[in-house]
């Protein structure tokens, strides 16, 4: 199983090292999740030809996956630390149902899928400690999530493959934009 950040042998062998700051821990956690996504994408791309499909073709889907927009304050123009942090946390909370869907979608990378899901939960906790305005963060409705999950799991095989690919790609892009913004904070 993948080793969570901070628990690899290098860390054990270097007890004299300075403990990670909150920002460094978040940075490391996101890179760890990105590594996990990369492994999952490899399996997905080996299994189907979804990865060759053009972005335009894939855009025609009914998934409401979180995406960074100018108004979210995470890009250089209109950068706003607090607005951006709220968007990152809200987006990660919205991704959780899609990460649940990914469980059981992988044969050789089942543990990796679980690691991505659990590491994201930890990341959300790290970020919530960093946020000042927790009231602005809206948590997805569990009933809505449950029915969405049921609907996604009822799709035919081709659509399930497409959904898996889109979730991984969108989650990767969201994390990349999030980390780029967090590195400015």
């Amino acid at each position: 199983a993948p080793v969570p950040p901070g628990e690899d042998s290098k860390d054990v062998a270097a007890p004299h090292r300075q403990p990670l700051t909150s920002s460094e821990r978040i940075d490391k956690q996101i890179r760890y999740i990105l590594d996990g996504i990369s492994a999952l994408r490899k399996e997905t791309c080996n299994k189907s030809n979804m990865c060759e499909s053009s972005k335009e073709a894939l855009a025609e889907n009914n998934l409401n996956l979180p995406k960074m927009a100018e108004k979210d304050g995470c890009f250089q123009s209109g950068f706003n630390e607090e607005t951006c942090l709220v968007k990152i946390i809200t987006g990660l909370l919205e991704f959780e149902v899609y990460l649940e869907y990914l469980q059981n979608r992988f044969e050789s990378s089942e543990e990796q899928a679980r690691a991505v899901q659990m590491s994201t939960k930890v990341l959300i906790q790290f970020l919530q400690k960093k946020a000042k305005n927790l009231d602005a963060i809206t948590t997805p409705d569990p009933t809505t999530n449950a029915s969405l999950l049921t609907k996604l799991q009822a799709q035919n095989q081709w659509l399930q493959d497409m959904t898996t690919h889109l979730i991984l790609r969108s989650f990767k892009e969201f994390l990349q934009s999030s980390l780029r913004a967090l590195r400015q904070m």
């Epitope: 996101i30 890179r31 990105l34 960074m68 890009f75 250089q76 990767k172 892009e173 990349q176 934009s177 980390l179 780029r180 590195r183 400015q184």
Partner: nanobody
């Protein structure tokens, strides 16, 4: 890691323009965040600009904003830095850098591959 090769440096008068180019032969170029840094004699390496893998997330240092433009052509495995209204203080060795996580950022430690650098000299 990817091999990065910069070109397009040279000597130019203040107010002039130059275009730097950075090319790689790496197959996975499109998944990297790419950046330009610069280093003047006796100074630390300084962030200039970076660009995400989809060209939709671009950041500039305040000192170059409005004068420099970073862009990428994934089909040609190339990133460009168009430098206009050059000033003597832009004189430095310009380095191309790549981040395999596709994130980027303003610190050199975020990048795992570096080019050899291209000298840019702006005379007054």
């Amino acid at each position: 890691q990817v091999q990065l090769v910069e070109s397009g440096g040279g000597l130019v008068q203040a107010g002039g323009s130059l275009r730097l180019s950075c090319t790689t032969s790496g197959r996975t170029f499109s998944s990297y965040a790419m950046a330009w840094f610069r280093q003047a004699p006796g100074k630390d390496r300084e962030f200039v600009a970076d660009i995400g893998e989809n060209s939709d997330n671009i950041w500039y240092a305040d000192s170059v904003k409005g004068r420099f433009t970073i862009s990428r052509d994934n089909a040609k495995n190339t990133i460009l830095l168009q430098m206009n209204s050059l000033k003597p203080e832009d004189t430095a060795v310009y380095y191309c850098a790549a981040d395999s996580y596709g994130v980027g950022g303003g610190k050199p430690e975020y990048y795992d591959s570096w080019g050899q650098g291209a000298q840019v000299t702006v005379s007054s």
